[in-house]
């Protein structure tokens, strides 16, 4: 499955929306800096077969999407800038699903890496648990809004990698 | 390979303008701080100011406000410190470092390799 | 501001001993503590960052310790190559600070 060009441009455009959300001084925050553990072996594309990759992907995205359509975001964040982030990874979710589809006949390997799927929705639960503790301050948010631009940036390094592969 | 690339000493008069410059390179340059620490001759490390390139939002410490201002050009990677009128007391080694801002990454893991100013009459 | 205060100033050791540097914060910094080396006329060098977390590609016989406002660092035992100058810094709060140093010379 090739990924279209337009999911790459998505998931710059998502990227650029996040970066724009932010509503206070990213300065005033530094005290609520948090280690989430990043499960950066995750987006090394090179250890798995395409399909694992585009199924953490995937993930990545799916989880993304749900942090930021809780109530709890829509109070925190400014609505536009919200409603139009989320649709960039609806957009990307489709694409990713299409892929999914696409690479289950031809890769006979396990769809998933479970371990994998497993270590990204434990790192989405570390953020919530954070979330919940810090009661959704905005400061908490502001250093979740800098961890998420950080995962995405992961998240489009490896889909580069996947397209070098193609 | 990550590098902060500072531009080259310089000697200046009392009461002259200075801009010094810091290139970033093998990151993503908005993705981190920027930030600047003088070294007297013989001395200490002193921070001076932070600045964010996405935004050009930037904090400085309260013994350099208004004596210097942080700057940054986020299209070519660059990042700058200057002088509207220096003072001999400016003569120092400047370097600048980088900064993983709201990340959990280490703090000021690159580092330029220090811009020599000299003020003298 | 956060005053940081570094002890001893300078110290005199042999290559092999065991060296400990101890920096206090005028209030709790948590562990938003960094560890730096200087050698002269050289850019400062990242040792460790929050208080214990060792920066990739030090050797492991640099490590720190505490929290709060009490920090320390040790070389468990000293290179030749380790005597420089060593700064702390506190991170949790701008305007960021340094200690003012500790210079560790051959005895």
């Known amino acids: 499955c090739d990924l279209p060009q337009t999911h790459s441009l998505g998931n710059r455009r998502a990227l650029i929306l996040l970066g724009q959300m932010g509503r206070i001084s990213p300065f005033s925050c530094l005290k609520d800096r948090h280690d989430f553990r990043i499960p950066q072996e995750e987006f090394d594309g090179n250890q798995f077969q395409k399909a694992q990759a585009i199924s953490v992907l995937h993930e990545m995205i799916q989880q993304t999407f749900n942090l930021f359509s809780t109530e709890d975001s829509s109070a925190a964040w400014e609505q536009s800038l919200l409603e139009k982030f989320s649709t960039e990874l609806y957009q990307q979710l489709n694409d990713l699903e299409a892929c999914v589809i696409q690479e289950v006949g031809v890769e006979e390997t396990p769809l998933m890496n479970e371990d994998s799927i497993l270590a990204v929705r434990k790192y989405f639960q570390r953020i919530t648990l954070y979330l919940i503790e810090r009661k959704y301050s905005p400061c908490a948010w502001e250093v979740v809004r800098a961890e998420i631009m950080r995962s995405l940036s992961f998240s489009t390094n490896l889909q580069k990698r996947l397209r070098r592969k193609d | 390979e990550v590098q902060l690339v500072q531009s080259g000493a310089e000697v200046k008069k009392p009461g002259e303008s200075l801009k010094i410059s810091c290139k970033g390179s093998?990151?993503?340059?908005?993705?981190?701080?920027i930030g600047w620490v003088r070294q007297m001759p013989g001395k200490g490390l002193e921070w001076m100011g932070i600045i964010d390139p996405s935004d050009s939002d930037t904090r400085y410490s309260p013994s350099f406000q208004g004596q210097v201002t942080i700057s940054a050009d986020k299209s070519i990677s660059t990042a700058y410190l200057q002088w509207s009128s220096l003072k001999a007391s400016d003569t120092a080694m400047y370097y600048c470092?980088?900064?993983?801002?709201?990340?959990?990454?280490?703090?000021?893991?690159?580092w330029g390799q220090g811009t020599l100013v000299t003020v003298s009459s | 501001d956060i005053q940081m205060t570094q002890s001893p100033s300078s110290l005199s050791a042999s290559v092999g001993d065991r060296v400990t540097i101890t920096c206090r914060a005028s209030?709790?910094?948590?562990?938003?503590l960094n560890w730096y080396q200087q050698k002269p006329g050289k850019a400062p060098k990242l040792l460790i960052y929050?208080?214990?977390s060792l920066q990739s590609g030090v050797p492991s016989r640099f490590s720190g310790s505490g929290s709060g406002t009490d920090f320390t660092l040790t070389i468990s035992s000293l290179q030749p190559e380790d005597f420089a100058t060593y700064y702390c810094?506190?991170?949790?709060?701008?305007?960021?600070?340094f200690g003012q140093g500790t210079k560790v010379e051959i005895k």
């Open positions: 093998g990151y993503s340059f908005t993705s981190y701080w």
């Open positions: 929050a208080a214990s």
């Open positions: 209030q709790s910094i948590n562990r938003f």
């Open positions: 470092a980088r900064h993983p801002g709201l990340n959990w990454a280490p703090d000021f893991d690159y």
């Open positions: 810094q506190q991170a949790i709060d701008l305007p960021f600070t």
